[in-house]
Interface confidence: medium
């Protein structure tokens, strides 16, 4: 018995191609010896058609090749443009002559079945249903009605009017008549699969007087839509499955060797690899939904499928849509840190990239929530006021034109840990995702404000000082007044930074802010921070309450950053030292926005109708600087 193995019978159709794999034992000699494909003649002779030595017969010219796969111990014969003349007996084998080790293969090429001229062709997508119309003469009205599927030898019953149903069609096939019309019956087959494709015959009556109709059912697999996306960008899969599955659970899965692994579904299942960077959004009552994935990685490339089924899992015979996603590694989106680390009580400055060609676009920052289908409520934006629970500790600084805006979050708690998205109402590919990790603080903060319980008295002078370590010496220090539209930087002269010295006294490094005289509008949150050019660093926040001289009660009411600011900033510095940018968060691209509750995955943030101007990041505010007195000691 030959150790070569292959298919004993191969059946195909005229015009098609076929790939025949032959297996050989794993030896070095076998891997290197000649492989051949020959056709057996009546005399028993086997005429070589193609071999691994480069021989190619005239009848195979331009339509066949033979490829050896020594690592698999297989070789493959590919033959294209098959004709009925290719029907016959062949051998695939190894050896210098065609009498070597071989395996017999029978190839049968059939004609494309010629459909009878009265054949009705139905073309349907996989998962949909078809209603086949079967007309008959009145005299066959009392007779049995049936639909059968043609095989090579016979016609296999699908369903008949005596309620007989083929096991493959149970629950999917219905035979019925409409109204009082006794000249036509219908067969509905639902949840169509590839295997339902083929030729059917519907029949009413028996024998020569029977009415017959030929039906060709073609079941089409959806052509995958090709999607080309950049590394670190985002992709939206828009899935439109139709009204009939509007009430079913929806899913997106990725094709694996033998299954389709669910990435997300509307029943709350989510692949951990996509944590923090995926949302699924039901669009309407017509079975439309979309899935957004941000922060695309190289390994996200592949074949995706969306579908609907009550289980939230892929199911044969249910409608699907498919995509082939390619991830281009030469990305225009900058490579930023995807994880930012902060400590409790501290702050993080997150640099969000956006398309530099769209500097006037609205910028947003939202927090990804994994519950339900996932959503991303906007926390702050250039025209979106800061959410109440982030009062005094969150601001967005837009730096026009340089392709980056900064989001600063201070007074961190462990509850701030999670995933956040940077997004704009412009180029949706630039949605980026950042994971914020917050650890318990183990040392004093770098920036410290005194006094800590700040209550200013109306009409008097009030000074707060911000102490900073020597490592921030060469960085620009600033105070800003926070409002829910941003943190308005208060003008200052940074004269201390221009002084030269040889030592740094840790205790004397401070930048002070003086309110003189204190007015009611001065009440609110103030931040002390450091930055280098447009790169923001650490911040710390303090709430200044304003009271009457009588020391009456005060209420918290953060005011507009553009109110009269009567500020003196003083800085005592005695050294230049190496600048250290701590907690400089540089995110890795991820996802998206719209409305306060960003649930319409593909929709852009221009729908965010929250009003108000963004706080200025560079002192170009509307406040009058003539009211500011700068005291430098």
């Amino acid at each position: 018995k030959s150790p070569i193995f292959g298919p004993q019978e191969v059946s195909s159709i005229e015009g098609d191609s076929v790939s025949i794999t032959c297996y050989y034992p794993d030896t070095s000699v076998n891997r290197h010896t000649r492989k051949y494909w020959c056709r057996q003649g009546a005399s028993g002779m086997c005429t070589t058609l193609i071999s691994s030595n480069g021989y190619l017969s005239k009848e195979y010219s331009g339509r066949a090749n033979l490829i050896n796969f020594p690592e698999n111990n297989t070789f493959v014969i590919n033959i294209e443009q098959l004709t009925q003349d290719d029907t016959g007996s062949y051998k695939c084998g190894l050896g210098t002559s065609n009498r070597g080790l071989s395996f017999d293969v029978s190839l049968e090429v059939s004609q494309v079945p010629e459909l009878p001229s009265d054949t009705h062709v139905y073309t349907k997508d996989i998962g949909r249903n078809v209603t086949i119309e079967c007309p008959f003469k009145r005299e066959n009205a009392p007779s049995k009605k049936s639909l059968c599927k043609k095989t090579n030898q016979s016609c296999e019953l699908v369903i008949d009017s005596t309620e007989k149903v083929n096991p493959s069609y149970i629950g999917r096939a219905k035979l019925f008549m409409k109204g009082t019309d006794l000249t036509v019956f219908y067969v509905n087959i639902s949840h169509l699969t590839h295997n339902d494709a083929g030729l059917y015959i519907c029949q009413a009556g028996e024998g020569p007087s029977a009415d017959k109709k030929n039906v060709d059912l073609q079941v089409l697999a959806p052509e995958p839509e090709l999607l080309y996306k950049d590394l670190r960008s985002s992709v939206t899969f828009e899935c439109d499955l139709g009204r009939e599955v509007a009430n079913e659970a929806k899913y997106l899965c990725r094709m694996n060797k033998e299954t389709c692994d669910v990435i997300i579904n509307t029943l709350g299942k989510r692949d951990p690899d996509f944590e923090g960077r995926i949302l699924i959004t039901p669009k309407d009552d017509n079975g439309r939904f979309s899935v957004l994935i941000t922060g695309l990685r190289k390994e996200d490339a592949g074949h995706y499928q969306c579908g609907a089924h009550s289980s939230g899992l892929p199911q044969e015979g249910w409608p699907i849509q498919t995509w082939q996603l390619f991830v281009n590694e030469e990305s225009t989106i900058p490579n930023r840190r995807s994880v930012v680390k902060g400590v409790t009580g501290g702050s993080v400055a997150i640099a969000c990239p956006y398309n530099p060609k769209e500097s006037s676009s609205l910028k947003y920052w939202c927090r990804w929530e994994g519950d339900g289908n996932g959503h991303c409520p906007v926390l702050v934006g250039t025209q979106a006021q800061v959410q109440e629970e982030y009062e005094g500790r969150l601001a967005l600084f837009d730096q026009p034109g340089n392709g980056t805006y900064t989001v600063i979050l201070n007074q961190l708690t462990t509850e701030d840990a999670g995933f956040y998205w940077c997004l704009t109402n412009g180029d949706s590919r630039w949605r980026t995702t950042i994971e914020l990790q917050v650890a318990e603080a183990t040392r004093e903060p770098n920036l410290e404000v005194t006094p800590q319980n700040a209550t200013a008295v109306l009409g008097e002078t009030f000074t707060v000082s911000c102490h900073y370590p020597c490592k921030f010496y060469s960085q620009e220090k600033y105070w800003c007044k926070w409002s829910n539209k941003g943190c308005h930087i208060l003008p200052s002269h940074d004269e201390g930074a221009r002084q030269s010295s040889v030592s740094c006294d840790q205790s004397s490094q401070l930048v002070s802010m003086t309110l003189n005289p204190v007015s009611k509008e001065d009440e609110g949150w103030y931040w002390c921070g450091v930055k280098q050019g447009q790169t923001y660093g650490e911040t710390t926040a303090i709430y200044i309450a304003v009271e009457e001289r009588t020391r009456g009660s005060s209420h918290v009411n953060p005011t507009d950053a553009n109110a009269r600011a009567k500020v003196a900033l003083e800085e005592e510095v005695v050294d230049s030292s190496i600048s250290e940018k701590e907690n400089k968060a540089i995110p890795n691209p991820g996802p998206f926005a719209n409305e306060r509750e960003i649930q319409n995955v593909g929709d852009q943030a221009q729908e965010n109708r929250a009003s108000g101007d963004a706080g200025s990041a560079d002192g170009q505010s509307r406040s009058s600087s003539s009211k500011h007195h700068h005291h430098h000691h």
Partner: nanobody, 126 residues
């Protein structure tokens, strides 16, 4: 999830015939392989026969020692596969398993098949 249900196994006299049937549900693609393996008491599971559909072509594979006696065929819907066994002998006694898989490369390797039935017992008495 793909499910395979075998039937048809029973006690048969040597020289007799038997038809095993395997019905599949959940096969979501048009290209797959579906066939039969058997395992005799105390022996390894061995390949019997397989049908493979790939890009419009159909491939039939059979083990050398069953050629001429066993025939594998399928229903029109490709979801049922039959194994017709003639000239049975006591060495054919085994549990016969139906197997299916997508992208099956090495048809004789059990590890290439992802889905298996529970098995049906065929006993051939002398």
């Amino acid at each position: 999830e793909v499910q395979l249900v075998e039937s048809g196994g029973r006690l048969v006299q040597a020289g007799g015939s038997l038809r095993l049937s395997c019905a599949a549900s959940g096969l979501t693609r048009s290209d797959y392989a579906m066939g039969w393996f058997r395992q005799a008491p105390g022996k390894e599971r061995e390949f019997v026969a397989t049908l493979k559909w790939s890009e419009g072509s159909r491939f039939m594979y059979r083990a050398e020692d069953v050629k001429g006696r066993f025939t594998i065929s399928s229903g029109a819907a490709k979801t049922t596969v039959w194994l017709d066994m003639d000239a049975l002998n006591p060495e054919d006694t085994a549990v016969y398993y139906c197997a299916a898989g997508f992208n099956v490369g090495f048809v004789r390797r059990a590890s290439e098949y992802n889905f298996w039935g529970q098995g049906t017992l065929v006993t051939v008495s002398s």
